[in-house]
Interface confidence: low
């Protein structure tokens, strides 16, 4: 990552952390950690689409993008997008959704982040080629089983001793201004809704965790993962791999995605197992679709509003919940590795399904549109536009309606992989996100 990308990564993390809703009373200011960055970079070089089994006591978020180069704002958006599926008060993630990336990003006690990216001609675990893999490691790790990411309350009202309030975040007293922190680059600061449960970036769809314990941390897998039961993750359909040990997407040959579409791979962060480990259902691999969008005039503008999940490069985020085996199988088109991973396409809803707005504005539009003829022959449509791939995982018992969302990639906590791969999601410039 360039120095600017590092700074942007920290700035965006802090921006999202400062703007959580409900507000956080104990949110620590995050700073860059070169050791974590080196660790992340080293793992990124391995070109494996799966969480680092050797990450130890480090949280981890993965993101990958094909053909377009790293896009920090997009990675952040994908991860943060899961917030729509996360219910802070209940500490639950919507069934079938991934929330681990989001919860890691806003994990109050996490105060150090280090990321590294590497261009992989072949990323082990996915069919895509020429992928830029981003790995972010966190300390202390987030996604601790049974814990909420942060305490709701007046900003900074519960800052630890030795910390003072700055921009709604608890920053160590006497600490020099973080050189890595960038000034707010988001021209339009995301205005999140009041409740985590339903908040969603204006254009995206986030996630949620289960009461008390993030759904993706649930150890028991109940019910079957019926196709219908599995939520699909969005624009923007990601999945996460859940395994007691961070699964490597390469465990088995990942399913091939027939559509050739460049994609962005976003990996979900896995919850850390500070407490008892969680067992996950057997996982199956789901092919990752490819997209072949041409991205032009791609100016890396860090000022991309985190709220706008509709970026040219679509990415997927998945909830960190595990789905029942039946659903895993139903969702997976390819055989999944015997590991406790579940691949299910999840597509987080961008908002409450009921909240639909007028879709057209025909005012003043009087020109007549001619309807096409409808031949009986099969209509052929050339897939155009980039697509995003995302792996989303959910934990056992996380059967429920899925909501459209972006699959951000793998999200894992120290030592364990939580969400099974729920599914591969394809989005405009392909964004592949998976939780491992």
């Amino acid at each position: 990552l360039t120095d600017e990308e590092k700074r942007l990564m920290v700035e965006l993390h802090n921006l999202y952390r400062a703007q959580v809703s409900p507000t956080a009373s104990d949110m620590l200011h995050m700073r860059w950690d070169e050791e974590l960055a080196a660790f992340a970079k080293a793992y990124a070089r391995q070109c494996v689409w799966g969480h680092n089994k050797e990450r130890g006591r480090r949280g981890e978020n993965l993101f990958a993008i094909t053909d377009e180069g790293m896009d920090v704002p997009l990675a952040m958006e994908e991860w943060h997008h899961e917030r729509e599926h996360y219910n802070l008060s209940a500490a639950t993630c919507s069934p079938g959704q991934m929330c681990g990336h989001y919860t890691q990003v806003v994990w109050a006690k996490t105060e150090r982040i280090g990321c590294g990216s590497h261009f992989c001609e072949k990323l082990q675990g996915v069919e895509e080629t020429n992928i830029e893999l981003l790995v972010c490691n966190y300390e202390p790790p987030g996604n601790v089983k049974g814990k909420r990411p942060y305490q709701e309350g007046t900003p900074c009202s519960q800052c630890p001793s030795g910390y003072h309030c700055k921009n709604s975040l608890c920053e160590p007293i006497g600490s020099p201004e973080d050189a890595q922190d960038l000034p707010y680059l988001v021209t339009e600061a995301p205005s999140f809704r009041a409740t985590e449960a339903s908040d969603s970036r204006k254009m995206g769809t986030p996630s949620s965790l289960a009461t008390g314990i993030p759904a993706f941390l649930v150890t028991e897998v109940s019910g079957s993962l019926a196709t219908k039961a599995l939520p699909a993750v969005e624009t923007q359909a990601p999945t996460s791999l859940a395994t007691k040990d961070p699964p490597s997407m390469a465990t088995e040959a990942p399913p091939c995605v027939t559509t050739e579409v460049p994609s962005i791979l976003a990996a979900h962060s896995l919850p850390s197992l500070d407490e008892e480990p969680v067992t996950f259902p057997k996982s199956t691999h789901v092919p990752i679709p490819k997209s072949a969008d041409k991205v032009t005039d791609k100016t890396k503008v860090p000022s991309r509003s985190p709220e706008n999940s509709l970026d040219p490069k679509m990415s997927l985020t998945g909830a960190r919940e595990l789905l029942p085996h039946a659903q895993e199988e139903a969702e997976a088109e390819a055989e999944l590795p015997p590991s406790s991973e579940v691949l299910a396409s999840v597509f987080p809803a961008q908002d409450k399904p009921g909240e639909l707005q007028a879709t057209l504005d025909h005012t003043g539009h009087t020109s007549s549109k001619s309807l096409p003829n409808f031949p009986n022959t099969s209509a052929t449509a050339n897939a155009t536009g980039g697509r995003a791939l995302a792996l989303q995982s959910s934990l056992p018992g996380a059967e429920g309606p899925d909501k459209p969302s972006v699959v951000s990639g793998l999200n894992s906590g120290p030592g364990h992989v939580w969400g099974p791969l729920l599914g591969l999601l394809l989005l405009p410039p392909l964004v592949l996100a998976g939780i491992f």
Epitope: H81, E234, T235, Q236, P238, L310, P312, S345
Partner: antibody, heavy 121, light 111 residues
Framework: EVQLLESGGGLVQPGGSLRVSCAAS????????MSWVRQAPGKGLEWVST????????HYADSVKGRFTISRDNSKNTVYMQMSSLRAEDTAAYYC??????????????WGQGTLVTVSS | QLVLTQSPSASASLGASVKLTCTLS???????IAWHQQQPEKGPRYLMK???????SKGDGIPDRFSGSSSGAERYLTISSLQSEDEADYYC?????????FGGGTQLTPL
């Protein structure tokens, strides 16, 4: 090559029901959200509904909520739209569209050629 | 409410350039949109996804003549060297809170 073929359109009386289908091929069907977008004669495009890749999440336009039901059978690579309590204003060409991604962000690509549904007595 | 506004019609000479505009409603200027083309008697065709920063992802097979740009709440589709086959209705579209929204469409007529 991605192909989307709609079928099931036809003439139906007001208050009646009809199910249109969209058979997909050329891509990993279960990994993509699918949507239905309609276009009334001489009018613009109107989004109708979207369903996630797994089928677990669905979204509807207010104009059809409670009357239309989107579903999919991933084993058959087919998405359906069950339309009931049809009204004259539902008359339109119904297009099936594949989402750019499972996230169902509503980026439609590609589109099918449509199937015409006419609601008239 | 998320609304996309487009001019009903536009025209330009063959070989010339034309710039179609799609305006996002107040409060939604950061939204990305997609441009779709619908030629007479045909189904829509995805052209590109255009982000608020002007970057865009074009669909497969979309000629280089098609490009997108952004300025504030305005999203533009520029077609250079206009061809007769470019005669079509152009729709901008975005995705909001659980819904997809289309603009009313612009009917482009090459002269």
């Amino acid at each position: 090559e991605v192909q989307l073929l709609e079928s099931g359109g036809g003439l139906v009386q007001p208050g009646g029901s009809l199910r249109v289908s969209c058979a997909a091929s050329g891509f990993t069907f279960s990994s993509y959200a699918m949507s239905w977008v309609r276009q009334a004669p001489g009018k613009g495009l109107e989004w109708v509904s979207t369903i996630s890749g797994s089928g677990g999440t669905t979204h509807y336009a207010d104009s059809v909520k409670g009357r239309f039901t989107i579903s999919r059978d991933n084993s058959k690579n087919t998405v359906y739209m069950q339309m009931s309590s049809l009204r004259a204003e539902d008359t339109a060409a119904y297009y099936c569209a594949k989402d750019l991604g499972l996230r169902a962000q509503g980026w439609f690509d590609p589109w099918g050629q449509g199937t015409l549904v006419t609601v008239s007595s | 409410q998320l609304v996309l506004t487009q001019s009903p019609s536009a025209s330009a000479s063959l070989g010339a350039s034309v710039k179609l505009t799609c305006t996002l409603s107040s409060g939604h200027s950061s939204y990305a949109i997609a441009w779709h083309q619908q030629q007479p008697e045909k189904g829509p065709r995805y052209l590109m996804k255009l982000n608020s920063d002007g970057s865009h992802s074009k669909g497969d097979g979309i000629p280089d003549r098609f490009s997108g740009s952004s300025s504030g709440a305005e999203r533009y589709l520029t077609i250079s060297s206009l061809q007769s086959e470019d005669e079509a209705d152009y729709y901008c579209q975005t995705w909001g809170t659980g819904i997809a929204v289309f603009g009313g469409g612009t009917q482009l007529t090459p002269l």
